[in-house]
Interface confidence: low
């Protein structure tokens, strides 16, 4: 019955030494749960055997049930086929009938399911993206496969996580599991390692030129780990960048052109999944001046018998501040004429009659004068001067 | 197996100046980046700077940048440390290093180290 009685009767001697029968004690205890009502709300874990292809459901009890339709081991069901169900009844002495009749919606098998890394490598820095894949078909229905992650204190419910603006070069551990019909049935940990971040920026300590030819840089490298530094150099729209080793703090630039604005910038990098370029550190110098090229395509020609038109084309290189053309005019080793333009082109009058001259013309920058461009020319006789004569006669 | 042994460590006033050499032995000079470091009396270990092999790269730490030089002999197989502007509190017993690596300022990338040289700055 639902209620039972539990009588007990004591006999015991009284000091006269006579029996006395002392009264009788009833205790009500309450009725047995049922055990539908007992195991109404039993969870089930079920674990995965690989080499059998099979399940087993371990059914999340307190004490040793009895199993009816199946046989349980330690409240254990065995060789479970994915995606079958089956039922087993659960009973125990501490409750009554009705028994629990328990339906086990087997999972489909682990190995169809794989935790994969879906982490772009180009964000491996801080970026971390796990997503679980099905390699393989099954017959479950896949509406009530749930996914868990759990990745520090957060917790999300997706298929597929991204955690972002992580730290570089960090360990981070992310625990998951796949639940069917709300049933545990396989659980996957991962450690990633965050890549390596781009490098900090280097210190640029001073960055000078202190000759036409040349310039140095010397810098502090980045704190962060790079493997090489990356120097590039622009004059006007010419790039040249040069890899230099992780351990170098000073660059000699040499072969450099005279009286030229260099911008330099300079970049730590790290080759890790991909290659990642710290941020620039930047600088500029303007090379001293030299002395400019030779001007060129020089003519003389003769605008009247005593008369030169010399005109020249530019240096190639100026290599200096200002622009100046000079025209010396020697007849033996004398300096004649010593003229200064803004551009190549000298009208020399009045020279002497049938003389030799030597006309040398050069640029001056402002700081140096470049190589003459020699030239020699005669003067004609006074043509005039002959025809008057002749005349006369 | 490189021996190093320093020397050039003494008593200088503050302001005054001191080179230290680092003579090596027993191994090929011009494979090894060289290093000095310091420990002042109850002090960790501390770096203060750093050559390459070819002694084209040098590297300071930031309270002796601008008053003390590294340079390097490979003939002579010897690394020097001018030290100019010394204050009191540069006093420590000062060691030479060899690196096969060579990365700057780690004391771990350091295989072979010196007994020391002590340098005192006091009036």
């Known amino acids: 019955s639902d209620a039972y009685l539990n009588a007990s009767e004591t006999t015991t001697l009284s000091p006269s030494g006579s029996a006395v029968i002392s009264t009788t004690t009833i205790a009500t205890t309450p009725s047995k749960p049922t055990c539908d009502e007992k195991y109404a709300n039993i969870t089930v874990d079920y674990l995965y055997n690989k080499e059998t292809k099979l399940f087993t459901a371990k059914l999340n009890v307190n004490e040793n049930v009895e199993c009816g339709n199946n046989t349980c081991t330690n409240n254990e069901v065995h060789n479970l086929t994915e995606c079958k169900n089956a039922s087993v009844s659960i009973s125990h002495n501490s409750c009554t009938a009705p028994d629990k009749t328990l339906i086990l919606d087997v999972p489909p098998g682990v190995e169809k399911f794989q935790l994969h890394d879906c982490t772009q490598v180009e964000k491996a820095d801080t970026t971390i993206c796990l997503k679980w894949k099905n390699i393989e078909t099954f017959t479950c229905d896949t509406q009530n496969i749930t996914y868990r992650f759990q990745c520090g204190n957060m917790i999300f419910d997706n298929k597929e996580i991204k955690l972002e603006n992580l730290e570089p070069e960090h360990e981070y551990k992310c625990d998951s599991e796949i639940l069917y019909n709300n049933h545990k049935f396989t659980n996957a940990s991962k450690i990633i390692k965050t890549d390596f971040g781009s490098p900090g920026e280097p210190q640029i300590i001073f960055c000078r030129s202190e000759a036409a030819h040349q310039g140095v840089i010397t810098w502090n490298p980045p704190q962060r780990s790079f493997h090489n530094f990356t120097l590039c150099y622009i004059k006007e729209t010419e790039k040249d960048c040069l890899n230099l080793d992780k351990n170098l703090i000073k660059y000699d630039l040499q072969n450099l052109k005279p009286y030229t604005k260099y911008v330099l910038s300079l970049h730590a990098y790290i080759i890790a999944k991909v290659q990642r370029n710290g941020s620039a550190a930047m600088c500029h110098f303007t090379t001293k001046s030299a002395p400019p090229s030779q001007v060129w395509n020089m003519t003389v020609s003769m605008t009247s018998d005593n008369s030169m038109h010399v005109k020249c084309r530019p240096p190639r290189d100026r290599n200096g501040p200002h622009e100046r053309y000079h025209l010396e005019v020697e007849a033996g080793n004398t300096l004649v004429r010593n003229e200064s333009h803004k551009n190549c082109d000298f009208r020399v009058k009045d020279l002497q009659y049938s003389t030799d001259y030597t006309f040398k013309a050069y640029f001056h920058n402002g700081d140096y004068p470049g190589e003459p461009f020699i030239l020699h020319h005669s003067t004609s006789y006074n043509s005039k001067a002959h025809h008057h004569h002749h005349h006369h006669h | 197996q490189v021996q190093l042994q320093e020397s050039g460590g003494g008593l200088v006033q503050p302001g005054g100046s001191l080179r230290l050499s680092c003579a090596a032995s027993?191994?090929?000079?011009?494979?090894?980046?060289m290093g000095w470091f310091r420990q002042a009396p109850g002090k960790e270990r501390e770096f203060v700077s750093s050559?390459?092999?070819?002694?084209?790269?040098?590297y300071y730490a930031g309270a002796v940048r601008g008053r003390f030089t590294i340079s390097r002999d490979n003939a002579k197989n010897t690394v020097y440390l001018q030290m100019n502007s010394l204050q009191p509190e540069d006093t420590a017993v000062y060691y030479c290093?060899?690196?096969?690596?060579?990365?700057?300022?780690?004391?771990?990338?350091?295989?072979?180290w010196g007994q020391g040289t002590l340098v005192t700055v006091s009036s």
């Open positions: 290093a060899a690196s096969s690596t060579w990365n700057n300022n780690d004391p771990t990338e350091y295989e072979y």
């Open positions: 050559i390459s092999w070819s002694g084209n790269s040098v």
């Open positions: 027993g191994g090929t000079f011009s494979d090894y980046g």
